[in-house]
Amino acid sequence: QVQLVQSGGGVVQPGRSLRLSCAASGFTFSRYTIHWVRQAPGKGLEWVAVMSYNGNNKHYADSVNGRFTISRNDSKNTLYLNMNSLRPEDTAVYYCARIRDTAMFFAHWGQGTLVTVSSASTKGPSVFPLAPSSKSTSGGTAALGCLVKDYFPEPVTVSWNSGALTSGVHTFPAVLQSSGLYSLSSVVTVPSSSLGTQTYICNVNHKPSNTKVDKKVEPKSC
Amino acid sequence: DIQMTQSPSTLSASVGDRVTITCRASQSINTWLAWYQQKPGKAPKLLMYKASSLESGVPSRFIGSGSGTEFTLTISSLQPDDFATYYCQQYNSDSKMFGQGTKVEVKGTVAAPSVFIFPPSDEQLKSGTASVVCLLNNFYPREAKVQWKVDNALQSGNSQESVTEQDSKDSTYSLSSTLTLSKADYEKHKVYACEVTHQGLSSPVTKSFNRGEC
C-alpha cells in the first residue's frame, strides 16, 4: 500500500538550514506529484510547496518563497524540502502529501515531522511541587501537582506514582515562555483524606536532555 | 490567492446529531474542493473530493455539496469517532489553500470549575523566581476568564494560560494559569488572588492566599 515516511525534522537555530525527506513506497514514485503542507502548533493546515511528477513545475507559498526549495530523486523514491534562512514562525509539523492521480487533493499523507526553530539550547527542566493545602481543597477533594519549568525542546512526559495513578490527572499542554523555554503543569485531584497516608510522586522525563526527576509532593509543613 | 473561509470555528454537538460545516471560497473554484478530518497528533485524512465525491472507505454519513464559492460538509448522524477538526481545501489554483478548520467538540452540560490556587514552592523561590498557579478543574463550556490580583491590583502581561483538550470521558476542560514574578517582586506583596468567571458560576469565584502564611 502507499506509504510516505518522513525524516529530517529537529531543532534548528534561526537563520540556519534543514532538509526534510519523504521516502515513498507502494506506488510508482516518478508518476506522482507530491506536496509539502505544514501545521504550526495549535494552528491549521498551511500549504507550503509542490513539485510536479516530472520536476518541471515548482510552486511555493509566499511565506517560504525564496527560502525553501523542493526537489526529488526518483531513483531513491524520495522528495526533499530544503529549508534555508529559517525563522521561528517556520516552527511546525511538516507533512508530505501525495495527490490522487492528476487531481490536486491529498489522498495520502506522511506521518509528519516536527521542525522547531529557536535560539534556545537543550535544557532539562526544574521540577517544583504544587503542594496541597486548604487553598487547594474543595469538598473532600484536594489538588496537588508539579510545575515543570524552563526546559527545551519539547516534549516532557509526566506520570504519577510510576503510572499507577492515572485517574484525575491533567497534564497541561506546554507554554512557550518569553525566555524561549517551555513550562507545563501536571495536576491530580485526590481525596483529602489520602494526603496523610498516600504518597504522591510525579515522574518527569525529558529525553532530549536525558533528565529524569521524581518529585514527592506533600502538604506544606508549617 | 483564493482564500477559504470556514464556519463555524467550533461546533458543539452530541452523538446522533446532524451537523453542517460551511466553506466559502473568495472566488469560484467550480467543484475543486476537498474535505479532510484530523485528530490530535495525527495526519489529516481525506474524506471528500470534487466537493461531493466520497473517498473510498469513508462512511456514507459524510455528505459533501456545493459548487462555485459555497460548500458544505454534513455529517448526517454524528458518531463518537467523528469528534475531530475538519478542513476544506481548494485545488483550483496553484496555492492549495485550506480553510482555518472547524473543531467538532462534544456538547456537554454546564459544569462550573473547581478552583485551586498554589503558592510558589520554597524550592523555586531559592532559584530567584516565583510561579503562582491557579487551577480550574473539570468545567464546561471551554470559555473561562482568569484574572490575577496582587494586593488587589489587577495584573496583566505576566501570566500564561494552558487548556487541556476536551476530556474523552466526561467532555470537560481544565485550565492552568501561571503568574510569574521575580522573587523580589513576589516578596514585595502579601495577597495573591485569582478570580475566575465562568458560565457555571453565578458570580466570580476568588481563591487567594497570604504570602508566608499556611
Epitope: - | V15, P80, G108, T109, A111, S168, D170, S171
Partner: nanobody, 112 residues
C-alpha cells in the same frame, strides 16, 4: 475504567421483543446525550436512537419508529432500548454511545 457497558442482546424470533441496557458512569449519564447505533454484517454502523441528557428529547431512525423506545433510569444511570416487533433486518451488533465513548456492543439476532 469502563464508561459504557451495554448488554441485553440475544437470539429472538421475528415479531419478538428484547430490551438492551447501557450502564454509564455518573458524569457521562447526567450530562450527555446517549445514543444507540447498530452494525449489520458487511454494513456501516448506523444511528438507531438517541435521548438527551435530561430525557426531554428523543430521536429515532425512520425504520424503527413505533417499534423501538429509548428511555433512561436516573437512579440506575442506565439507558434502555426497548425493541418490539423485531424483524430479521434488525439483526446487528448494537452499540451504546455517548460523547467520544462507545460501549463494547451486544449482538441481536432476529430469526425468521
Amino acid at each position: 475504567q469502563v464508561q459504557l457497558q451495554d448488554s441485553g442482546g440475544g437470539l429472538v424470533q421475528a415479531g419478538g421483543s428484547l430490551r438492551l441496557s447501557c450502564a454509564a458512569s455518573g458524569r457521562i449519564f447526567s450530562t450527555h446525550t446517549m445514543a444507540w447505533f447498530r452494525q449489520a454484517p458487511g454494513q456501516e454502523r448506523e444511528f438507531v436512537s438517541s435521548i438527551s441528557w435530561n430525557g426531554a428529547v428523543t430521536n429515532y431512525l425512520d425504520s424503527v419508529k413505533g417499534r423501538f423506545t429509548i428511555s433512561k433510569d436516573n437512579a440506575k444511570n442506565t439507558v434502555y432500548l426497548q425493541m418490539n416487533s423485531l424483524k430479521p433486518e434488525d439483526t446487528a451488533v448494537y452499540y451504546c454511545a455517548a460523547g467520544r465513548n462507545w460501549g463494547q456492543g451486544t449482538q441481536v439476532t432476529v430469526s425468521s
